[in-house]
């Protein structure tokens, strides 16, 4: 039987909560890595690919050491929301061109959505201040060409890959301080 009605729930161990968030982040990172390999194989594109609408990488090494849990989770959630928007945009705008990557892109979007919900839950469990709803972001312009869309895909997956590594590092560092 659970606790009697009205009694406070036992607060979950924050380290265990962070651990499961790290594992979900790493599984998403592996999905991203495998999808990046497929993208490079099917649509090779040399050089750096940037997309102005993507978030800039959150932190450098020095800043990582000074991080606090609220700022990591807040920043990570904001960045991942942006990547989720970009993945949705990519699937809509490039549906036919990226058909060969479609099941994996769908899986990636689902897991990204799940990680965002996990971060939201973690923030409420740790009694961190809840963010106001995000203002609606301006719509992303459709890619100017198929090639532009492919370059955008490289930029989105590359940025997400690096953001997730930063996230894992930040969360692991914070876990040791709890």
């Amino acid at each position: 039987p659970g606790p009697p009605p009205g009694s406070p729930r036992a607060s979950p161990d924050p380290r265990a909560e962070l651990d499961s968030t790290v594992l979900l982040t790493r599984s998403l990172l592996e999905d991203t890595r495998q999808l990046t390999i497929q993208l490079k194989d099917k649509f090779p594109a040399d050089g750096d690919h940037n997309l102005d609408s993507l978030p800039t990488l959150a932190m450098s090494a020095g800043a990582l050491g000074a991080l606090q849990l609220p700022s990591v989770l807040t920043r990570l959630r904001a960045d991942l929301l942006s990547y989720l928007r970009h993945v949705q945009w990519l699937r809509r705008a490039m549906g036919s061109s990226l058909k060969t990557l479609e099941p994996e892109l769908g899986t990636l979007q689902t897991r990204l959505d799940r990680l965002l919900r996990r971060l939201q839950l973690l923030m409420s469990r740790l009694a961190l201040p809840q963010l106001p709803p995000d203002p609606p972001a301006p719509p992303l312009a459709p890619p100017s060409s198929t090639w532009g869309g492919i370059r955008a895909a490289h930029a989105i997956l590359g940025g997400l890959h690096l953001t997730l590594d930063w996230a894992v590092r930040g969360l692991l560092l914070l876990k040791t301080r709890l």
Epitope: R26, S27, R33, S60, G62, L64, H161, L164, V168, R169
Partner: antibody, heavy 119, light 111 residues
């Protein structure tokens, strides 16, 4: 060809420090982490830590925290590991290894650098 | 830290035979759809070489006679038909938590 080339063997006295380099070629340096692994005679392989070349931000095995320092020179595609306050148990082969981001498995290894600590 | 125990410590077989190497973890290393176990081969005087990552994925360039399986705490590396160059020491490694740790190794020798 993807390669990691490490600096040569070192002989050090107890209490001294050693700095090993690992030069990467044949791939985009920033796309992978660089990990360091110790193999002492008759012991298991032991992970020391890793560093993300883009972010910096090393992560260390607690056992080596405070004694190991991982750095990178992005412009030279080179990673470094410095180990301080050397003792006889640090006598080992040290490997750099390319690691998938945040996954800690190692698909390309350097040839190893033998460090001997002896008075 | 998670402890990995490999068995047997050594194994003597002939070329053409099937080799089955075991790795047991002190706690589950499978979660969120992935099993964080990897296998390496090491020959004397050489660096380890990645064979299998994430329990069952064959690393590029590794012959198809190598395969990995398992989940939870029990994992297996199988070499379907041994070749002369397969006689070496094999290590499993986990990356479920930090620090990643390695098994003590299984030495595969020619009978």
């Amino acid at each position: 060809e993807v390669q990691l080339v490490q600096s040569g063997a070192e002989v050090k006295k107890p209490g001294a420090s050693v700095k090993i380099s690992c030069k990467a070629s044949g791939y985009t340096f920033r796309d992978y982490n660089m990990d360091w692994v110790k193999q002492a005679p008759g012991q298991r392989l032991e992970w020391i830590g890793d560093i993300n070349p883009t972010i910096g931000a090393p992560i260390y095995n607690q056992k080596f925290t405070g004694r190991a320092t991982l750095t990178v020179d992005k412009s030279a595609s080179t990673a470094y590991m410095e180990l301080s306050s050397l003792r006889s148990e640090d006598t080992a082969v040290y490997y750099c290894a390319r690691g998938a981001l945040a996954h800690w498995y190692f698909d390309v290894w350097g040839q190893g650098t033998t460090v001997t600590v002896s008075s | 830290d998670i402890v990995l125990t490999q068995s047997p410590a050594s194994l003597a077989l002939s070329p053409g035979e099937r080799a089955t190497l075991s790795c047991r973890a002190s706690k589950s290393v499978s979660t969120e759809g992935y099993s964080y176990i990897h296998w390496y081969q090491q020959k004397p005087g050489q660096a380890p070489r990645l064979l299998i990552y994430l329990a069952s994925n064959l690393e590029s360039g590794v012959p198809a006679r190598f395969s990995g399986s398992g989940s939870g705490t029990d994992f297996t590396l199988t070499i379907s038909s041994l070749e002369e160059e397969d006689f070496a020491t094999y290590y499993c490694q986990h990356s479920r938590d930090l620090p990643p740790t390695f098994g003590q190794g299984t030495k595969l020798e020619i009978k």
